[in-house]
Amino acid sequence: QSPPGKPEIHKCRSPDKETFTCWWNPGSDGGLPTNYSLTYSKEGEKNTYECPDYKTSGPNSCFFSKQYTSIWKIYIITVNATNEMGSSTSDPLYVDVTYIVEPEPPRNLTLEVKQLKDKKTYLWVKWLPPTITDVKTGWFTMEYEIRLKSEEADEWEIHFTGHQTQFKVFDLYPGQKYLVQTRCKPDHGYWSRWGQEKSIEIPNDFTLKD
């Protein structure tokens, strides 16, 4: 039996700059029941606060609701582990909410096979930004990637589309079924997970409909 090992805050993420969660790895418990508490202060403030919500985001986590989240202040966060034999504290972690955004994937992915005047066929992929992001006001600047592959293929073909919410894919094989997904990344944050997969078959005998 021994004091607990040093915990480590290993991840903090925000879906929208309005709430965020931090998760920690507990370290060894020293063979004893061990309690964990997350405490934080904010830049320029002397006060220290305890985690407002240990439940919402699951075990070994702290959820900061809107009421506790500010993008104007840096959070200095530590996790303390305590058992009968002693205690141990993580290294402090400095968190700027602007830099931990991992948004939801883009929504309303639509796929349409189109044809140019020269009869060249292409796949027109369109989508919308995730619901929660206020892209119009510049609060978020979002970049996008799409990936596609034919059902038979092993590898995805990835296209970076910049800030565009549509993309044209040429040189696709007629008769093949293609799977498509999109993801997004805010200017200072992390890529979202890949969104829901959509599929479309490229017709063998595509003719332009009026």
Epitope: H10, G44, D91, L93, Y94, V95, D96, T98, H188, Y190
Partner: antibody, heavy 118, light 112 residues
Framework: QVQLQQPGAELVRPGTSVKLSCKAS????????MHWVKQRPGQGLEWIGV????????NYNQKFKGKATLTVDTSSSTAYMQLSSLTSEDSAVYYC???????????WGQGTLVTVSA | DVVMTQTPLSLPVSLGDQASISCRSS???????????LHWYLQKPGQSPKLLIY???NRFSGVPDRFSGSGSGTDFTLKISRVEAEDLGVYFC?????????FGGGTKLEIK
């Protein structure tokens, strides 16, 4: 505690390439972005670029595009920077540096001195 | 790129004196989120740089309160109220509001 270990020095020939390493320990490697910074002898610091080890997303200073390539090996918690077509202008100390979830550098490696000489 | 200009280049001081270093940026350093990402680092001889001040005026963990930062827009200052021997080295200002992040040329604090 967080440590970033870099080899002390590399002597390389002009026109060749060199791959610098930065072995991270004391934290979850994939959770924090890794930056690289150049310092020429007696001069200031230049930010080269950054890599997100969780998905290898990179962002380069335009000045170093084509010169530096950032990669990671998550199995060994090591970040790499390859410098190509070396000239005397590339002789410098190169640091890897980690931020927290912020845009400054909280932890620095000791730096690798690269000397380009025939 | 944002150019960071530090003055003076060299600052000879006596131990116990106050020291002041200026840093001027070629563009305003207010980020779209309202924060000003101007930081100060100290590099002691033979060592890697270490963070002293983040976001203009916030002392990093373990940094003595004799260090203070101030400023806004394009003009920033680092002050050391009573210089100690361990403060000697090269001080760099740095901005991370605009990509690429850039550094000042450095100010060498040395004994008079």
């Amino acid at each position: 505690q967080v440590q970033l270990q870099q080899p002390g020095a590399e002597l390389v020939r002009p026109g060749t390439s060199v791959k610098l390493s930065c072995k991270a320990s004391g934290y979850t490697f994939t959770s924090f972005w890794m930056h690289w910074v150049k310092q020429r002898p007696g001069q200031g610091l230049e930010w080269i670029g950054v890599i997100d080890p969780s998905d290898t997303y990179t962002n380069y200073n335009q000045k170093f595009k084509g010169k530096a390539t950032l990669t990671v090996d998550t199995s060994s918690s090591t970040a790499y920077m390859q410098l190509s077509s070396l000239t005397s202008e590339d002789s410098a100390v190169y640091y890897c540096a980690r931020g927290d979830y912020s845009n400054w550098f909280t932890y620095w490696g000791q730096g690798t001195l690269v000397t380009v000489s025939a | 790129d944002v150019v960071m200009t530090q003055t003076p280049l060299s600052l000879p001081v006596s131990l116990g004196d106050q020291a002041s270093i200026s840093c001027r940026s070629s563009q305003r350093l207010v980020h779209s989120n309202g924060n000003t990402y101007l930081h100060w680092y100290l590099q002691k001889p033979g060592q890697s740089p270490k963070l002293l001040i983040y976001k203009v005026s916030n002392r990093f963990s373990g940094v003595p309160d004799r260090f203070s930062g101030s400023g806004s827009g394009t003009d920033f200052t680092l002050k050391i109220s009573r210089v100690e021997a361990e403060d000697l080295g090269v001080y760099f200002c740095s901005q991370s509001t605009h990509v690429p992040w850039t550094f000042g040329g450095g100010t060498k604090l040395e004994i008079k």
